[in-house]
């Protein structure tokens, strides 16, 4: 397992949300990929290929998300100061072997500023 | 050709309840969430209820938690909806609805193909 | 809950005409934001997906546009088809709601 610092942009603010951008190498064909606040998984997506290289995209919960080649990205809205913690990216490669988990993570600061859209 | 097809509605008393199943065709069901959506006679649309793939998150729209139940049975590409305690203000054409995965969204509620609807009348 | 207000109820047009319906949000809604066709006695027809994503199959006389909680669906050249009522709906926090619907009536 590493454990580390996104070495990226993770968090973009946008009318009163953030998405938390989770990257993987773009060689990753099957996966699971958790989002973590603190200890709590909040969200998670799951590609795997079937039979005939059918894809499978599959969610444990209602949490908006977004697949690339080579991230996912997870919405999170109607942010308050609750939200201020740390956001870990939780990686399990299954394809191509060996399995591995990757951890990656920052911290979500929340200012005033960011939660200026959901006064409207 | 996906394939959404209600059945179960009827008249019902006030009180009493009613079980409205959907069957799906066409794709692969148990990759995504459902949900029921209702009409009003002569009204806007309302969502109802949602429930991912495998039944680990389920939500409802205040006004019938307590009283509906979601559920799904893979096996059978069916989605069903209990409705006890039914009132007046129930009567609806129910949809059933497939949560749509265009452009690489997982998880937001919009909804691509729906069925037909099957009329449920709450009268005494 | 979000409210969805969308003007004008009806609208009268003729074929060939540019209507434009608008959405609000009473709330900031980012772009999560898919419209709907109903036409009499039918099921509801996918349009539009995050504010301004046109739906596969669906023709590009149709567009979206709009992010925050002012949204709005253009129907660049009216079509006898195009004839129906039209909903807005927020997926942003739940629970997800519906506009009241804008119906498009031949004039």
């Known amino acids: 397992e590493i454990n580390g610092s996104a070495n990226y942009e993770m968090f973009i603010f946008h009318n009163g949300g953030v998405q938390i951008l989770c990257k993987y190498p773009d060689i990753v064909q099957q996966f699971k990929m958790q989002l973590l606040k603190g200890g709590q998984i909040l969200c998670d997506l799951t590609k795997t290929k079937g039979s005939g290289n059918t894809v499978s995209i599959k969610s444990l919960k209602f949490c908006h998300s977004q697949l690339s080649n080579n991230s996912v990205s997870f919405f999170l809205y109607n942010l308050d100061h609750s939200h201020a913690n740390y956001y870990f990216c939780n990686l399990s490669i299954f394809d191509p072997p060996p399995f591995k988990v990757t951890l990656t993570g920052g911290y979500l600061h929340i200012y005033e500023s960011q939660l200026c859209c959901q006064l409207k | 050709e996906v394939l959404l097809v209600e059945s179960g509605g009827g008249l019902v008393q006030p009180g009493r309840s009613l079980r409205l199943s959907c069957e799906a065709s066409?794709?692969?069901?148990?990759?995504?969430?459902m949900h029921w959506v209702r009409q009003a006679p002569g009204k806007g649309l309302e969502w109802v209820s949602g429930?991912?793939?495998?039944?680990?998150?389920?939500d409802y729209t205040d006004s019938v938690k307590g009283r509906f139940t979601i559920s799904r049975d893979n096996a059978k590409n069916s989605l069903y909806l209990q409705m006890n305690s039914l009132r007046a203000e129930d009567t609806a054409l129910y949809y059933c609805?497939?949560?749509?995965?265009?452009?690489?969204?997982?998880?937001?509620?919009?909804?691509?193909?729906w069925g037909q609807g099957t009329l449920v009348t709450v009268s005494s | 809950d979000i409210q969805m207000t969308q003007s004008p109820s009806s609208v009268s047009a003729s074929v060939g005409d540019r209507v434009t319906i608008t959405c609000r949000a009473s709330q900031g809604i980012s772009s999560w934001l898919a419209w709907y066709q109903q036409k009499p006695g039918k099921a509801p027809k996918f349009l539009i997906y995050a504010a301004s994503s046109l739906q596969s199959g669906v023709p590009s006389r149709f567009s979206g546009s709009g992010s925050g909680t002012d949204f709005t669906l253009t129907i660049s050249s009216l079509q006898p088809e195009d004839f129906a009522t039209y909903y807005c709906?927020?997926?942003?926090?739940?629970?997800?709601?519906f506009g009241q619907g804008t119906k498009v009536e031949i004039k």
């Open positions: 429930i991912t793939w495998n039944s680990g998150s389920i």
């Open positions: 066409g794709f692969t069901f148990d990759d995504y969430a």
């Open positions: 609805a497939k949560e749509s995965t265009s452009g690489s969204y997982y998880n937001v509620p919009w909804f691509d193909y």
């Open positions: 709906q927020q997926a942003n926090s739940f629970p997800w709601t």
